[in-house]
Interface confidence: medium
């Protein structure tokens, strides 16, 4: 049924879904703080533009009686229940912020007549790609996939002279929500990554992973996994690793690697870490001071969701356009807005673009160093360290298949 939106006559409301099941175990209080900080900034920006309007957020809490696992596995119905609650109360805002779980976002998008924009901090899975009124403010799996294919094909860098076409993917089912969907995308036989690779096998057991490290008959030298360094250590420990093995550790939302006092442990020498370029001011900002790196990105996405709404509201009001129209609902894409920590770019499908950074461990300094960066907006790789002090022979990344000559 058509729900009237509290979204006119100088009063504009944001509906924020505060779901018990969330992509990250962030206390809802922290998310409220992030939203409230965003509201303060938006009000200031609108006032500066001479727009005398009211912007508020309504936090919609789930009762938590049925969907109480705390993670994304029971989020599907919780999202729909919250929408029903909104519908019954006739309390829909101009925009919906949340949910963060892929399951709930997919189902809500499927089961509702969306005449309003949805902004998500999460919804990483491929099933949430290409949704006309959905905006995602944390890097979705599609972006990771495009980087990996781009990097695999690259063969004209001083430190990577072979294009790769093979990979193992380690996926044991205990991953965090972001990793779960990133690895799902790599595993899916119909995905771009699978389509572009000649050989790909998913390793599901610790022993499979451990055996590959020294197996002379392995079909690829490259293993992709997702998580923090401690996740890798639990798996690999201090085991010997063949000299031409390359482990790609996807750890996007972890900016510790860039901190001054961080030294890379010895077991990271065969590892390239893929992470996101850290924000400028976040480490000391008031809303994020006590959050771990992952949580900082999650809370920041909520805050940026508010700023994105403020940006669109300002544009539509300045142009004298109606907010409760399909045009507004479809407008949250193909743009750059001023986020909390600098400009934020959304692609044609409303997904955030970012700079991914590939790090290696310097054998000289034992520090993480930037090998290259990748701009997801233009799908382009930019080498940074032309003479890396790698552990690999000749300071070059090995071929992905042992014994194969130059490609």
């Amino acid at each position: 049924s058509q729900v009237s939106q509290n979204c006119h006559n100088g009063s504009y409301e944001i509906s924020v879904l505060m779901m018990g099941n969330s992509a990250f175990a962030e206390p809802l209080k922290n998310l409220e703080d992030a939203v409230n900080e965003g509201l303060e900034i938006v009000r200031g920006r609108l006032q500066n533009a001479g727009l005398n309007v009211t912007v508020n957020a309504t936090f919609m809490y789930s009762d938590g009686l049925i969907h109480n696992s705390g993670d994304c596995r029971s989020s599907t119905c919780e999202g729909l229940d919250l929408l029903r609650k909104i519908s019954n109360a006739q309390r829909m805002g101009c925009v919906l912020i949340g949910p963060s779980c892929t399951y709930s976002t997919f189902q809500m998008y499927l089961d509702t007549e969306l005449s309003y924009p949805m902004i998500s901090a999460g919804s990483f899975g491929l099933s949430c790609d290409y949704k006309e009124t959905l905006t995602r403010l944390m890097s979705p799996a599609r972006k990771l996939m495009y980087f990996l294919v781009n990097f695999w094909k690259t063969n004209d860098l001083p430190f990577k002279t072979y294009s790769w076409s093979t990979s193992y993917v380690y996926k044991n089912g205990t991953e965090t929500e972001d990793c779960f969907w990133y690895l799902n995308a790599l595993e899916a036989s119909v995905s771009y990554f699978s389509h572009e690779l000649g050989f790909k096998v998913v390793l599901r057991q610790d022993k499979e992973f451990q055996d590959i490290l020294m197996d002379h008959n392995r079909k690829s030298n490259v293993i992709i996994m997702c998580g923090g360094p401690e996740f890798l250590y639990k798996l690999k420990g201090d085991r010997a690793v063949a000299e031409d093995i390359v482990i790609i550790l996807v750890d996007l939302f972890n900016d510790q690697y860039f901190e001054d006092n961080v030294t890379a442990p010895d077991y990271m020498k065969n590892v390239l870490v893929l992470t996101l370029s850290p924000g400028n001011s976040l480490l000391n900002s008031s809303f994020s001071r006590n959050l771990s790196p992952t949580k900082r990105d999650f809370a920041l996405a909520y805050l940026n969701g508010i700023l994105l709404f403020g940006h669109m509201l300002k544009i539509f009001l300045e142009n004298g356009e109606n907010i409760t129209t399909p045009k507004f609902a479809h407008a949250f894409r193909n743009l750059t807005f001023e986020g909390y920590d600098g400009p934020v770019t959304l692609d044609d499908w409303g997904d955030v673009d970012s700079t991914m950074v590939l790090l290696y461990t310097s054998v000289d300094t034992k520090k993480y160093k930037v090998l290259l960066t990748y701009d997801t907006h233009v799908n382009k790789t930019y080498p940074v360290d032309m003479s890396p002090t790698f552990t690999w022979k000749n300071s070059k990344l090995p071929n992905d298949i042992t014994g194969r000559g130059p490609q």
Epitope: T176, G228, P229, E230, G237, Q256, N261, V262, S292
Partner: nanobody, 127 residues
């Protein structure tokens, strides 16, 4: 189950130093995060310092610049070096660890984020 044993507590004059140590039965690199908490008489337990999975460190505002958290993988220990101690640093110090991120992450900020705790070691700073 991970075992944690603290040592190094004691009595010291204001301005003095102590080094607390936390011995584990697992290598520190395999731990998602580790923290030192303290509890003063009649007060809630507070997180003083934490070391995260990649080696990033976090400190309470009240100890920044005075305390340093570190880990020694070979010796299977975490340490808290406490310099320029003040009477308000008095309390029981506990080390706590969390083994992994779990299915949906962990902030490593509150007591609830940590599953393994030591017995505690007493620190007394007199003026």
């Amino acid at each position: 189950q991970m075992q944690l044993v603290e040592s190094g507590g004691g009595s010291v004059q204001s301005g003095g130093s102590l080094r607390l140590s936390c011995a584990t039965n697992e290598p520190p690199y395999s731990i998602y995060c580790m923290a030192w908490f303290r509890q003063a008489p009649g007060k809630a337990r507070e997180r003083v310092a934490a070391i995260l999975n990649a080696g990033g460190t976090r400190y309470a505002d009240s100890v920044k610049g005075r305390f340093t958290i570190s880990r020694d993988n070979a010796a299977k220990t975490f340490a808290l070096q406490m310099n320029s101690l003040k009477p308000e640093d008095t309390g029981t110090y506990y080390c706590a660890t969390r083994a992994d991120a779990g299915r949906w992450g962990s902030a490593c900020t509150t007591e609830l984020d940590f599953g393994n705790w030591g017995q505690g070691t007493q620190v007394t700073v007199s003026s």
